[in-house]
């Protein structure tokens, strides 16, 4: 086992049945938000499969936040009787592997990969940059790891940490950044400043992903790209918190090396994007 392998593996004490989430937001990490209040709230922990308490700061955060333990349980847990342990090989894959490729409605054409259930292989497609569905991967390897069967009929690798697109927005995820960090913010935070083609000189800010800071630039008033903010605060809020240290709190669970690796299987809620 290399260190890199372990970094991307979720290891748990016991064999758990596949986790089928009732709502995709139940997979979000607990997010206390940027504010400083101390409010007792509850979130669903996908690793322990239980609703747990956390301290919420009072603003922002995400949907995996509930006023009471009961509300959390109602939204994110199923009765054990209703938990169907999937056994067939086809069902080992996440549900989204069986969705048709969907380029989405936007026009920022990006090369992505999808699992083609007809050919049983991951294939390239052009993604428009927004919406679409979860059968959409940045790399061929990622697609193969999550959706293709290995030579012995089992999944090639675990996908327990593939939680960066758990809603149906499928906004562009990042290109790769230095190894200690992962970028989970909008992909345009990684693009260079672009003045655009007009003649105005508007004061704007862009996120410089090399130095990790928001910097001013002069915007021409039209065109350019999305890495363009009217204030430094806006820029920081959109891009700065996208950089997450892999070893920070809420990161990956690690225990002793020799335990059996367990994939955390997550079946996302249906998104209702159909091919006609």
């Amino acid at each position: 086992d290399s260190e890199e392998d372990e970094e991307h593996t979720i290891i748990t004490d016991t064999e758990l049945p596949p986790l089928k989430l009732m709502h995709s937001f139940c997979a979000f990490k607990a997010d206390d938000g940027p504010c400083k209040a101390i409010m007792k709230r509850f979130f669903f922990n996908i690793f322990t499969r239980q609703c747990e308490e956390f301290i919420y700061g009072g603003c922002e955060g995400n949907q995996n936040r509930f006023e009471s333990l009961e509300e959390c349980k109602k939204m994110c847990t199923r009765d054990n009787a209703n938990r169907i342990i999937k056994t067939t090989l086809q069902q080992e894959k996440p549900d989204f592997c069986f969705l048709e490729e969907d380029p989405g409605i936007c026009r920022g054409y990006i090369t992505r990969y999808f699992y083609n259930n007809q050919t049983k292989q991951c294939e390239r497609f052009k993604y428009g940059g927004c919406l679409g569905n979860m059968n959409n991967f940045e790399t061929l390897e990622e697609c193969k790891n999550i959706c293709e069967d290995g030579p012995n009929g089992f999944q090639v690798d675990n996908y327990g940490t593939q939680l960066n697109a758990v809603n149906n927005s499928l906004t562009p995820q990042s290109t790769k950044v230095p190894s200690l960090f992962e970028f989970h913010g909008p992909s345009w935070c990684l693009t260079p400043a672009d003045r655009g083609l007009c003649r105005a000189n508007e004061n704007r800010f862009y996120y410089n992903s090399v130095i990790g800071k928001c910097r001013p630039f002069k915007y021409s008033g039209c065109g350019g790209n999305e890495n363009n903010f009217t204030s430094k605060q806006e820029c920081l809020r959109a891009c700065k918190k996208g950089f997450i240290q892999r070893i920070s709190k809420g990161g990956l669970i690690k225990t002793k090396r020799k335990r059996k690796k367990q994939r955390v299987k997550i079946a996302y809620e249906e998104i209702f994007v159909k091919n006609m």
Partner: antibody, heavy 124, light 107 residues
Amino acid sequence: QVQLQQSGPGLVKPSQTLSLTCAISGDSVSSNSGGWGWIRQSPGRGLEWLGLIYYRSKWYNAYAVSVKSRITINPDTSKNQFSLQLNSVTPEDTAVYYCARYLGSNFYVYSDVWGQGTLVTVSS
Amino acid sequence: DIQMTQSPSSLSASVGDRVTITCRASQGISSYLHWYQQKPGKAPKLLIYGASTLQSGVPSRFSGSGSGTDFTLTISSLQPEDFATYYCQQQNGYPFTFGQGTKVEIK
């Protein structure tokens, strides 16, 4: 200049099918630059997105969960128009229905052109 | 679904006033937010897309800001033709959802 012209009946009986058409001028229903959709507005519900279609070498659609089992949006390339069908209507479906063009930029999609609106009343 | 909450639901202002309308999303939506203006009996009209980009032909007195969960539409100097209802709408994921609207009335 893109324009959308809506047509269809203003009165539909409960349990029947609501059918509206949106004729496009100045753009093509098969355009690769965006899509076409329907939104409705009622005093009780405000503005409610119903669904959209778009063409990217084949047709795709996305529907609101609230109407998913009852809705169909279809393109008609020969007439350069698209239609809304909403089955099994009830008085709660009474609203002003708008068709709209969804323009897709690099990362955004927004309704930049709207039809004039059609008040549809569901009543026996 | 992502809930969009606008405040205030209505406001009274005079010509020349600076008006600010806020929109809050129930979860982070980056800058996938658009603003529309609607006058009685008319279809909504796009003002701003992507939280801060002014739609072509819209006067520069309109501006938008924000990202994540909190967004603002500002009219720097209210004109007679600006008395209308304003809606925010998210595009972060299906279904697209709108705020309940903010009605700007003459004081």
